[in-house]
């Protein structure tokens, strides 16, 4: 059980106050983290509170400003990047968001040696992506879907690609579906370790159907946003990978990297690229039916000026029970011999663990094992491997950092974080300097987040980087809800849940219950993290009990739970929420006449299906930006879990799992449907179809749209949204305003 101290003592009770909705909307109780921008084994950059860029040397204890806030302000810079030779800094301004990761910006190059901006051969604007080479100060950037190279910041650019076209050909940047569902980055180019080569992806979207929606703006006529967006079963982007020698790029030109034959025989995806050395690269490919992944190691042949990917260096990863990998196929972390690597994949018992691959996947040596999962490999050095897992005390929603000594035999394992601040910190991530000489630990909770700096050899804490003292003080007079993380055992399924309880919770009383659900494949909602958010307010001020439940399909508890939803989305996720609610009712403190459910995105889909389950458990519920039919969602994501919407594959379940098919069942619940009209991700179409089905079934419901808002419903829409949802729930639960 994780109990958040409510800090309520009788003597203090008068000075304590509940959270208000205003607190949440103003971000009054938001926390800070500190991630060093490492530039060597012992140095990092950090942007100070007054916006100076400061270089810190851990070993000398010295720090100095490398770039003043005056310089930053002169171009309204919101971000920066130091060249590896430390001669130049790029300054980023005019940030303009595109999709989840992508944005365009204006870039200025500042010469640190003379304290002036580089004049002549300035960069064009707006740029879609820009990065330094890993050594020296070469620049690669993407402008109007083409890639350019500068040997030095003041040099004229060399154009590497010429076929880039808006919404047609993307070079060095992903198209919509690769950005959102495969790469999870704004870029699709990768420098080799010493900057000799530049690899990049070309995405051809010429044949992809286009989603079009109105953007109302302020003009007399709305404009139409067009995005090549492959929905389930539609034509996909065609991807090619090229590598160019950046020393004399005009000589040989870009060289295409061959696709493994077993992949190229049908539709496929490129999933990631990892440089091993300057002359060895590792590419990962995935069949469109995403249960077969191939990792291909390619070598540069100087005499041929080509990239050779021998079949003997192809490693196949296949899933027989679900899809390949977790949310994504894991990426390899190469060891110092530049051919063997460490990788997370399912072991024979169906738990994701670290394996060491020297020759073939079949001969892989398992490094970690147990009924828990390795989650991320942070760093491999000559003698240590650092990773995170949820092994400690068998809580799947925790993350601790471990070190395995790979230099000694047998390898020994040490938990670096388990006992550091045990009550406060149970969910960590880490950031390592070169050669893991030092590292930062960022603890996200369950207590107030704290970031600390550590010695990579001894694991000794060197200093606190950020401890959120202001937040701690601000919370001293706040009645925070209590939180507990527990599990239910139902029909051989373990359902972990987090319950958020009002500050003066009394088990003998009855409380309204709100289920917050996401429930998407390979997600996890029950995590030991700190948050003061909308549901904290609902518990603190409005006296609701809020519960989050991780059911079948969720992550980090083994393949049996994860792959249970394979090819049948919308069934077990909903069943498990309902099962949990019944168990909560049995606990005796839930008013069974006042139970609601809400979710966003995938959670909106699950909440809609739960409301339409016909159980009579839910009085009301909210779906924000829900998927309503898997035929409307992106191919890469949907087909991973559902296969294809074709007669000979899985069309029947695509049809059976829609929200619209259950329109009649909404008759006895209060339903609030919410969507942004400019949602590029889960298209407004989804809610439009739900609304149409409900109207056709003559079922009353409430709805709210947010004009020109995307999937995030940000800015003023956020305030309106949470205010609106609060009113809806209070009305549903008969709570006075």
């Amino acid at each position: 059980i994780v109990l958040r101290p409510s800090r309520v003592h009788n003597s203090e009770e008068n000075t304590m106050r509940a959270l208000t909705l205003k607190d949440i909307l103003n971000g009054t109780f938001s926390y800070k983290t500190f991630f060093p921008n490492w530039i060597s084994g012992q140095e990092y950059l950090h942007q100070s509170a007054d916006n100076n860029i400061v270089l810190y040397n851990i070993e000398t204890g010295q720090s100095y400003t490398i770039l003043s806030n005056r310089t930053m302000k002169s171009v309204n810079a919101s971000n920066y990047g130091l060249s590896p030779d430390r001669q130049f800094v790029y300054l980023e301004s005019d940030y303009s968001k595109l999709w989840r990761y992508s944005y365009t910006a204006t870039y200025y190059i500042y010469d640190l040696s003379n304290g002036e901006f580089v004049r002549g051969n300035e960069l064009p604007r707006p740029i879609q992506y820009l990065c330094w080479s890993p050594v020296g100060s070469k620049l690669a950037y993407v402008y109007q879907n083409n890639i350019y190279l500068k040997q030095r910041p003041g040099d004229p650019p060399f154009q590497i690609t010429f076929n880039g076209r808006e919404n047609k050909i993307f070079n060095g940047i992903p198209d919509w579906v690769y950005e959102e569902e495969m790469l999870a980055t704004k870029y699709a180019l990768w420098w080799s370790p010493n900057g000799k080569f530049l690899a990049y992806a070309e995405f051809n979207d010429t044949d992809i159907p286009v989603i079009a929606y109105s953007y109302y703006g302020d003009e007399q006529y709305p404009r139409t946003i067009n995005i090549p967006y492959p929905k389930a079963g539609a034509k996909n982007p065609v991807v090619r990978i090229f590598i160019i020698d950046t020393t004399y790029p005009a000589y040989v030109g870009p060289q295409e990297v061959p696709v493994p034959a077993m992949i190229a025989s049908s539709d496929y995806y490129f999933s990631w690229l990892t440089w091993v050395t300057d002359e060895r690269v590792c590419l990962q490919w995935l069949k469109r039916v995403q249960n077969v992944s191939v990792l291909s190691i390619c070598d540069f042949r100087e005499d041929w000026q080509t990239w050779d990917c021998p079949k003997t260096q192809e490693h196949i990863e296949e899933s027989r029970t679900g899809w390949a990998g977790g949310f994504f196929v894991s990426t390899p972390v190469f060891s110092y011999d530049a051919i063997s690597y460490y990788k997370i994949f399912s072991d024979k018992d169906g738990y994701k663990h670290i394996h060491y691959i020297k020759d073939t996947v079949e001969n892989a040596i398992q490094i970690t094992s147990g009924k828990w999962e390795a989650i991320n490999i942070f760093r491999v050095t000559q003698d240590s491997l650092f990773y995170s897992s949820n092994e400690f005390e068998e809580y799947p929603g925790r993350r601790n950092i471990y070190r395995i000594s790979i230099g000694s035999y047998p390898p020994s394992k040490k938990c670096v974080t388990c006992h550091l601040r045990k009550e406060r910190c149970q969910y960590y991530t880490a950031s390592f300097s070169d050669y893991a000489k030092y590292y930062a630990l960022v603890c996200y909770g369950p207590g107030i987040p704290i970031s600390t700096l550590h010695d990579g050899r001894t694991d000794q804490e060197i200093k606190i980087l950020e401890e959120n003292k202001e937040l701690e003080n601000a919370l001293k007079n706040i009645q925070l809800p209590k939180e507990e993380i527990k599990k239910l055992e139902v029909d051989e399924i373990t359902l972990w849940y987090k319950m958020i309880l009002p500050p003066q919770f009394d088990r003998s009383k009855k409380y309204p219950l709100l289920i917050q659900v996401y429930g998407g494949p390979c997600s996890q909602s029950v995590r030991s993290v700190f948050a003061v958010n909308w549901i904290s307010y609902l518990a603190s001020k409005e006296g609701m009990v809020i519960a989050l439940v991780d059911g079948r399909g969720t992550a980090f508890q083994g393949d049996k739970l994860l792959y249970a939803v394979y090819r049948k989305l919308g069934v077990y996720e909903v069943e498990d929420q309902i099962t949990a609610v019944r168990k909560f009712i049995e606990m005796g403190f839930i008013d069974e006449k006042r139970i609601a459910i809400w979710g966003w995105s995938y959670g909106g889909y699950v909440s809609s299906l739960a409301l339409a389950s016909g159980t009579g458990l839910f009085k009301c519920g909210i779906a924000v930006a829900p998927v309503s039919s898997w035929e409307y969602y992106a191919s890469v994501y949907t087909e991973r879990f559902m296969g294809l919407p074709t007669k000979d594959d899985n069309l029947e379940h695509y049809k059976n799992s829609t929200v619209m098919a259950r329109a009649e069942y909404f008759r006895n619940v209060d339903y609030l449907l919410i969507h942004g009209t400019a949602d590029d991700n889960v298209h407004f179409q989804n809610s439009a179809q739900i609304a149409k089905a409900l109207v056709n079934a003559q079922v009353d419901f409430q709805a709210m749209w947010y004009s020109d808002q995307n999937h995030g419903l940000s800015g003023l829409s956020t305030n309106h949204l949470y205010t609106h949802m609060t009113h809806f729930l209070k009305q549903c639960f008969s709570l006075s305003d």
């Epitope: 004229p156 010429f162 004399y248 790029p249 005009a250 000589y251 040989v252 295409e256």
Partner: antibody, heavy 117, light 108 residues
């Protein structure tokens, strides 16, 4: 030893067509971008066209765009230049050269194309 | 397109003398993309220098290249009889790649 051997030149009337070939040997042909460069009698060098190693990308000088087509057959180690709608100003020695935009490290001996009525 | 202007048009020198050939670009060219070629009558051009200063395979060390930005130079330290020819500079910075009009080095 790298060798490039052009053929297919000759006399052609304005508006006519000609197809030049360049047989390559001594290197992994499919790995390299290749170019055509021409030289009008008594004049300097002018880049005409280039093609990537796989043949997937082609590039042309404005003066020949829409009239000339560069292609390659990697199984035959041969580079081609299909020239249509020929004009008097296309009269030149045509060289095939190894390289994309430069440097061009190996050149053929050239083949003369004369456009005249 | 980038225009390359070579000077002088003709250079009359004796064997053993030093030859300095200039190539000026209408806009900045990164040194990685500047090359020099030699062409003798009735022959194909031959690559001498690439990357503004790197000698191609088999090129004697009396040939050297230098320069950056818009001004580049080819130097032949001691002219040999076989060096009398036409020399072209070439840029690959922008499409289309362009050549200078050439400098003829002739025997004085």
């Amino acid at each position: 030893e790298v060798q490039l051997l052009e053929s297919g030149g000759g006399l052609v009337q304005p508006g006519g067509s000609l197809r030049l070939s360049c047989a390559a040997s001594g290197f992994t042909f499919s790995s390299y971008a290749m170019s055509w460069v021409r030289q009008a009698p008594g004049k300097g060098l002018e880049w005409v066209s280039a093609i990537s190693g796989s043949g997937g990308s082609t590039y042309y000088a404005d003066s020949v765009k829409g009239r000339f087509t560069i292609s390659r057959d990697n199984s035959k180690n041969t580079l081609y230049l299909q020239m249509n709608s020929l004009r008097a100003e296309d009269t030149a020695v045509y060289y095939c050269a190894k390289g994309w935009l430069g440097p061009f490290d190996y050149w053929g001996q050239g083949t003369l194309v004369t456009v005249s009525s | 397109e980038i225009v390359l202007t070579q000077s002088p048009g003709t250079l009359s020198l004796s064997p053993g003398e030093r030859a300095t050939l200039s190539c000026r670009a209408s806009q900045s060219v990164s040194s990685s993309y500047l090359a020099w070629y030699q062409q003798k009558p009735g022959q194909a051009p031959r690559l001498l220098i690439y990357g503004a200063s790197s000698r191609a395979t088999g090129i004697p060390d009396r040939f050297s290249g230098s320069g950056s930005g818009t001004d580049f130079t080819l130097t032949i330290s001691r002219l040999e009889p076989e060096d009398f020819a036409v020399y072209y500079c070439q840029q690959g910075q922008l499409i289309p790649p362009t050549f200078g009009q050439g400098t003829k080095v002739e025997i004085k």
